[in-house]
Interface confidence: medium
């Protein structure tokens, strides 16, 4: 028989939401509702805001963050980075996979100081069984949390 | 024999454009070109402004919408929602899926008051057989539409 | 025996990223690594930019570009643009694939003048053997190269 | 190799105005900012504006214009006094992400400038 | 304004030292950060860029470090050219600023 790892078993895939509590202000990473609503794990587990993997492969994983404030007040970073990390148990620091830096305070106005913003990463990496990947955004605090559909996290298998 | 949704059919997967006729102005989703150029529908069909699914699963589902004004007049609003959301026989309303929302018009500057801007979403979501994916865009008369390439909706199934 | 492209070979997938080489500040499209670090190649290649094509079918690209300025100096453009495109032998000259534009310098504010933003393209398009795709921006000088996480370019069939 | 030579006027009398042209030579004038800096005898240096952008101190008094189809800029300051007296320098700020960012690379020779009645 | 407080404003040194100076920004200005080197009658010259970057040409003796708020300038080994007066820049917001200057001397 031909091994290939799509003929007998589901492909691995998880989409997980945001929640109230998601923000923990810890410095950790974001935390993820996976079962309620959209949210689901198949093929792959979640561990403190990370998602594990427990079948080696090229994954695609992807997050969105919705982030929203109100002009830039002092003490709040003018530089948002958003970042999508792997966690190895063959490496003592997290390393980084994805990572964008986007500068939102600026979307205010003259007639407006409320801005939103959005930040989008995807790509593919290879995670080996028992890595994970977890989200984080730096300043979190302009995070905008709702519905579970405007900041969310995921992966599958390629 | 192992049943596995790859091994003898083809994934479904589509890629609509934007064109034209997409803005209609009517409070109703974006519409969409289906087999023009880049767009295509492979295992999934399509009815006015829906991607329609024929075969459950997960899906991941994406849009592009390439935004553009010229300051922000009056009567525009300053936050822009771009939105996937379900439409399913079981329930009366739409479902938000994957939502984002934007404040473009910070974009313009001193020196050039006309501004450009790019949302983009995808994730993961189950979709049973029936059900129908469609995208918003709230104030839609700031997408900006050209060929194709600019604004764009999709899915393939994981 | 069923034909299926997954039944017995892997899955072509790439990711590519931003190395100090990527800008070559002659008009040609962005330069990538695709071996060191987090990126490979699986059944795809790679010649001067463009992932090159060796199976013929559905792929779902992609591209992210980490874009900074300090303002928006004279004789830069106000206006980015991030594109995919498609070379292929039966036509002269380059097809757009997904594009994006951006005035990213807008984001400046009267606290900083450094603005940080970020570029991510999405979708399926078919591909033939020996077609090529590459990454171009328009004004590539304000494109923040790094580590590779930043800037990155891949693709998966589907 | 680019290189700034700077002119204008030496010595003024109170309340003139201070006229400096830069030119930018073997260099493009696009992607760049463009900057004057002044330093008064034996102290630091200060930093007087670019196109569009002054020092609050001097707002009111400054003009930093262009002239792109000669590859130029120029400063003027008027109603100068004695607290005016320094080295002016044009100077250069990178600012691509071909060449780095936060820097300013390129500098004029300085020109002193003295005001006394 | 951002203000930039360079520290110490001199100091003595010899040849092969190790010279350190600081700069500290009032408020964080991430990695908008430049150093000169000026010599009396001349223009500032160009060591460091974006807090940590060697401009071409520069001995590799100079180094710079820091983000945020708290800077460095480091001369490995004083050569006898480096007897200058050095100034940190913030190009963060407007308007521009400078530090104060440290003036370093032969000991």
């Known amino acids: 028989l031909i091994q290939e790892r799509r003929s007998h078993e589901v492909n691995p895939a998880a989409h997980l939401t945001g929640a109230n509590s998601s923000l923990t202000g810890s410095g950790g990473p974001l935390l993820w509702e996976t079962q309620l609503g959209l949210a689901f794990l198949r093929g792959l587990s979640y561990h403190d805001g990370a998602l594990v993997v427990t079948k080696a492969g090229y994954y695609y994983i992807y997050s969105k963050v919705q982030l929203g404030g109100v002009g830039c007040p002092l003490g709040l970073a003018s530089t948002i980075t958003h970042g999508l990390y792997k966690r190895t148990p063959r490496y003592p620091e997290e390393l980084e996979l994805l990572v964008s830096q986007q500068s939102p305070c600026g979307r205010a106005t003259s007639s407006s100081r409320v801005w939103w913003d959005s930040s989008f990463l995807g790509g593919v990496v290879h995670l080996e069984a028992g890595e994970e990947v977890v989200v984080r955004v730096l300043d979190e605090r302009l995070v905008r949390l709702r519905d579970g559909t405007r900041s969310y996290f995921g992966a599958f298998m390629v | 024999l192992i049943q596995e949704r790859r091994s003898h059919e083809v994934n479904p997967a589509a890629h609509l454009t934007g064109a034209n006729s997409s803005l209609t102005g009517s409070g109703g989703p974006l519409l969409w070109e289906t087999q023009l150029g880049l767009a295509f529908l492979r295992g999934l069909s399509y009815h006015d402004g829906a991607l329609v699914v024929t075969k459950a699963g997960y899906y991941y589902i994406y849009s592009k919408v390439q935004l553009g004004g010229v300051g922000c007049p009056l009567g525009l609003a300053s936050t822009i929602t771009h939105g996937l959301y379900k439409r399913t026989p079981r329930y009366p309303e739409e479902l938000e899926l994957l939502v984002s929302q934007q404040s473009p018009c910070g974009r313009a500057t001193s020196s050039s008051r006309v501004w450009w801007d790019s949302s983009f979403l995808g994730g993961v979501v189950h979709l049973e057989a029936g059900e129908e994916v469609v995208v918003r865009v709230l104030d839609e008369r700031l997408v900006r539409l050209r060929d194709g390439t600019r604004s764009y909706f999709g899915a393939f199934m994981v | 025996l069923i034909q299926e492209r997954r039944s017995h070979e892997v899955n072509p997938a790439a990711h590519l990223t931003g190395a100090n080489s990527s800008l070559t500040g002659s008009g040609g499209p962005l330069l990538w690594e695709t071996q060191l670090g987090l990126a490979f190649l699986r059944g795809l290649s790679y010649h001067d930019g463009a992932l090159v094509v060796t199976k013929a079918g559905y792929y779902y690209i992609y591209s992210k570009v980490q874009l900074g300025g300090v303002g928006c100096p004279l004789g830069l453009a106000s206006t980015i643009t991030h594109g995919l495109y498609k070379r292929t032998p039966r036509y002269p000259e380059e097809l757009e694939l997904l594009v994006s534009q951006q005035s990213p310098c807008g984001r400046a504010t009267s606290s900083s003048r450094v603005w940080w933003d970020s570029s991510f393209l999405g979708g399926v398009v078919h591909l033939e053997a020996g077609e090529e795709v590459v990454v171009r921006v328009l004004d590539e000088r304000l494109v923040r190269l790094r580590d590779g996480t930043r800037s990155y370019f891949g693709a998966f069939m589907v | 190799q680019v290189q700034l030579q700077q002119w204008g006027a030496g010595l003024l009398k109170p309340s003139e105005t201070l006229s400096l042209t830069c030119a930018v030579y073997?260099?493009?004038?696009?992607?760049?900012?463009w900057n004057w800096i002044r330093q008064p005898p034996g102290k630091g240096l200060e930093w007087i504006g670019e196109?569009?952008q002054y020092n609050p101190s001097l707002k009111s008094r400054v003009t930093i214009s262009v002239d792109t189809s000669k590859n130029q800029f120029s400063l003027k300051l008027s109603s100068v006094t004695a607290a005016d007296t320094a080295v002016y320098y044009c100077a250069r700020e990178i600012a691509t992400a071909d060449k780095g960012y936060y820097g300013l690379d390129v500098w004029g020779q300085g020109t002193t400038v003295t005001v006394s009645s | 304004a951002i203000q930039l407080t360079q520290s110490p404003s001199s100091l003595s040194a010899s040849v092969g030292d190790r010279v350190t100076i600081t700069c500290r920004a009032s408020q964080g200005i991430s990695s908008a950060l430049a150093w000169y080197q000026q010599k009396p009658g001349k223009a500032p010259k160009l060591l460091i860029y974006d807090a940590s970057s060697l401009e071409s040409g520069v001995p590799s003796r100079f180094s710079g470090s820091g983000s945020g708020t708290d800077f460095t300038l480091t001369i490995s080994s004083l050569q006898p050219e480096d007897f200058a007066t050095y100034y940190c820049?913030?190009?963060?917001?407007?308007?521009?600023?400078f530090g104060g200057g440290t003036k370093v001397e032969i000991k």
């Open positions: 073997g260099g493009s004038f696009s992607g760049y900012y």
């Open positions: 196109i569009n």
């Open positions: 820049q913030q190009f963060n917001s407007y308007p521009l600023t």
